[in-house]
Interface confidence: low
């Protein structure tokens, strides 16, 4: 995938040069007023009928350097009695995110944009029962 | 949070220039082999006991320009009979993501990194009953 500018706006922009030499202001702005990164992690991961655990994915040459990836705790969902319900499945909700990866040994520092697919949490769905033909 | 440049590592880099003129290769790489963006949207949003809808958030000056934001359909969860269970709540699972925003009227194109908090899907949790003191 590539990000192509509306080249009409800057008529002399070469697509090839544009893609590889875009200037980015790396002051990170929150589009919400609150400092998002300081918010307390929610306790939904324990209270959900499809509970999950968070695993630390760490890479010093990436921003964000630490990404927490969800994994469902059980294949099934937990019912009101705290037992696993074999008619209901825990499934992972995934989200595609952008990360910045530092190009190795680049000076001045250059980055590339990467897409990652990360697990964010789990939800409970009815098992699909396939009938025999 | 504050961003301070490591101006040292590339000794001739001016802090001010560094922050605002970092080169980024905007050819977007997938860190997974598969072309992530072509994957079919999952049908979990309909099959979940805490179903959700997806709302299109579009901004032509942002990459990605389209972000799909989840909203839970109900305050409660759906039980096996398809009825709302008043002991169980549908709650939104949120994820902090990075986006690139084009600086207004910049020519050549420059971008800034923004953090956004987006809803990804919903999960079902037991209502917390607060005891009277």
């Amino acid at each position: 995938a590539a990000i192509i500018p509306q080249s009409s706006a800057c008529p002399n922009t070469e697509a090839k040069d544009f893609l590889q030499n875009v200037k980015v202001n790396l002051k990170v702005f929150n589009s919400l007023g609150a400092k998002v990164s300081s918010r307390r992690p929610s306790d939904y991961l324990n209270r959900s009928t499809s509970p999950w655990t968070l695993h630390r994915n760490e890479d010093p040459d990436r921003y964000p350097s630490v990404i927490w990836e969800a994994q469902c705790r059980h294949q099934r969902c937990v019912n009101a009695e705290g037992k696993l319900d074999h008619h209901m499945n825990s499934v992972l909700i995934q989200q595609e995110i952008l990360v910045l990866k530092r190009e190795p040994e680049s000076c001045p520092f250059t980055f590339r944009v990467e897409k990652m697919l990360v697990g964010v949490g789990c939800t409970c769905v009815a098992s699909i029962v396939r009938q025999a033909a | 949070a504050a961003i301070i440049p490591q101006s040292s590592a590339c000794p001739n880099t001016e802090a001010k220039d560094f922050l605002q003129n970092v080169k980024v290769n905007l050819k977007v790489f997938n860190s997974l082999g598969a072309k992530v963006s072509s994957r079919r949207p999952s049908d979990y949003l309909n099959r979940s006991t805490s179903p959700w809808t997806l709302h299109r958030n579009e901004d032509p000056d942002r990459y990605p320009s389209v972000i799909w934001e989840a909203q839970c359909r109900h305050q409660r969860c759906v039980n096996a009979e398809g009825k709302l269970d008043h002991h169980m709540n549908s709650v939104l699972i949120q994820q902090e993501i990075l986006v690139l925003k084009r600086e207004p009227e910049s020519c050549p194109f420059t971008f800034r990194v923004e953090k956004m908090l987006v809803g990804v899907g919903c999960t079902c949790v037991a209502s917390i009953v607060r005891q009277a003191a």
């Epitope: 760490e58 921003y63 350097s65 | 301070i4 970092v22």
Partner: nanobody, 119 residues
Framework: EVQLVESGGGLVQPGGSLRLSCAAS????????MYWVRQAPGKGLEWVAE????????YYVDSVKGRFTISRDNAKNSLYLQMNSLRAEDTAVYYC????????????WGQGTLVTVSS
């Protein structure tokens, strides 16, 4: 949970010395460059010193070169700043910070330790 706890600040006369320490926990300390940053009264943040993951390279802002020494002990998850020949203009709250990638997005830093250089 990431924690950075600084100590060692205090009141010192011009020309004196202090050694600041920072105890780190909650992340893989040896994988990250670490930094000392300071904020003088009424001023913005100033990057002071950086040390790479293995301690092999150190960098300093010009105003402290030859006077300050940054070091680390990865076995103890600790960062240090030895400050010699202190001047009045070194008066500031000193913070240790964990590096992300460039530029540094200091999500994590401690409460700071106040260094006052005065006669």
């Amino acid at each position: 949970e990431v924690q950075l706890v600084e100590s060692g600040g205090g009141l010192v006369q011009p020309g004196g010395s202090l050694r600041l320490s920072c105890a780190a926990s909650g992340f893989t300390f040896s994988s990250y460059s670490m930094y000392w940053v300071r904020q003088a009264p009424g001023k913005g943040l100033e990057w002071v010193a950086e040390i790479r993951q293995d301690g092999s390279e150190q960098y300093y802002v010009d105003s402290v070169k030859g006077r300050f020494t940054i070091s680390r002990d990865n076995a103890k998850n600790s960062l240090y700043l030895q400050m010699n020949s202190l001047r009045a203009e070194d008066t500031a709250v000193y913070y240790c910070a964990k590096g992300e990638i460039l530029p540094l997005y200091f999500d994590y830093w401690g409460q700071g330790t106040l260094v006052t250089v005065s006669s």
